[in-house]
Interface confidence: low
């Protein structure tokens, strides 16, 4: 049985021409993996803020957004259950790994940036 995760490009509050530009980019459009394996979803961001959080959300078919995990800019790599983050501040990269994949993990995943 295949796990099929559709990953959307999501740009979070990008203020063009402002000195407080925030930008979040997810380059993968979709990823398919077998159950019980792990998948890593990449997210790159830009920010002029010096203290911030990156959030990962899962969107259900009903469009409801479920919060998964939060990574602070001053914190060690976050981990919560089957979700873990590989945070590389210098590279402005915050990748989400979902381990032991289940069929219910099939969804859209969003990366967002905030204070």
């Amino acid at each position: 049985m295949l796990f099929s995760s559709l990953l959307c490009v999501f740009v979070a509050f990008s203020y063009s021409g402002s000195s407080v530009a925030q930008k979040v980019t997810q380059a993968q459009s979709s990823v398919s993996m077998p159950v019980r394996k792990a998948v890593t979803l990449n997210c790159l961001y830009e920010t002029s803020w010096w203290s911030y959080y990156i959030f990962w959300y899962k969107q259900l078919p009903s469009k409801e957004m479920i919060f998964l995990i939060r990574q602070g800019s001053d914190e060690q790599n976050a981990k919560s259950g089957r979700y873990s983050v590989n945070f590389k501040k210098a590279a402005k990269s915050v990748a989400l790994t979902i381990s032991a994949l289940q069929l219910e993990d099939s969804a859209k995943y969003f990366c967002a940036l905030g204070e």
């Epitope: 509050f13 203020y15 402002s18 000195s19 407080v20 002029s48 803020w49 010096w50 203290s51 911030y52 602070g72 001053d74 914190e75 060690q76 905030g114 204070e115």
Partner: antibody
């Protein structure tokens, strides 16, 4: 461009109240906490408190609890600080600031005098 | 009233900041920051978390220190550097607190 535009100078009587405003533009107002800072020659810079405009949640410096009330109007992207029961000790310049990006208003001077 | 530090243009200036308790957060970071306030202006961030220069801040500004003792160095003072320098901490919040300030002025 991010801007925090504060209201003009205030001259108020002892015992009265005053409300200062801080209009934000150039960023998503509800996403970032608005902080207020008091400055006097004697005490320097003092953090009054902060408000999360998205949720209305506030945090105050114990020293200013009951003195300052922080609110916000999301529709106009404006933060407010009401100062109550004013005395000469409240005479100061008050700044609003979106702290973790280092954006500050120009400051509002409050003078309490009879 | 801020302390006064008279300097000559082109000289190095060192401004110190001492905390009554360690500013090392439980997450390992030290939230000690430096601001410059020029006359008639609001404060502007120079250095955050001890040694990180904020965007647009010239490299003649550097921060160092650990625990309770911190220093801001200006390698070659220029006229535009004059003003009051404040340290501030956000390790133990609320409240976010500031030092009393050091006024950098021409000797």
């Amino acid at each position: 461009q991010v801007q925090l535009q504060q209201s003009g100078a205030e001259l108020v009587r002892p015992g009265a109240s005053v409300t200062l405003s801080c209009k934000a533009s150039g960023y998503k107002f509800i996403d970032y906490e608005m902080h207020w800072v008091k400055q006097t020659p004697v005490h320097g810079l003092e953090w009054v408190g902060d408000l999360d405009p998205g949720t209305g949640v506030t945090a105050y410096n114990q020293k200013f609890k009951g003195k300052a009330i922080l609110t916000a109007d999301k529709s106009s992207s404006t933060a407010y600080m009401e100062l109550r029961s004013l005395t000469s000790e409240d005479s100061a310049v008050y700044y609003c600031t979106v702290w973790s990006a280092d954006f500050w208003g120009q400051g509002t001077s409050v003078t309490v005098s009879s | 009233t801020p302390l006064s530090l008279p300097v000559s243009l082109g000289d190095q200036a060192s401004i110190s900041c001492r905390s009554s308790q360690s500013l090392v957060h439980s997450n390992g970071n030290t939230y000690l920051h430096w601001y410059l306030q020029k006359p008639g202006q609001s404060p502007k961030l120079l250095i955050y978390k001890v040694s990180n220069r904020f965007s647009g801040v010239p490299d003649r500004f550097s921060g160092s220190g650990s625990g309770t003792d911190f220093t801001l160095k200006i390698s070659r003072v220029e006229a535009e550097d004059l003003g009051v320098y404040f340290c501030s901490q956000s390790t133990h919040v609320p409240p976010w607190t500031f030092g009393g300030g050091t006024k950098l002025e021409i000797k």
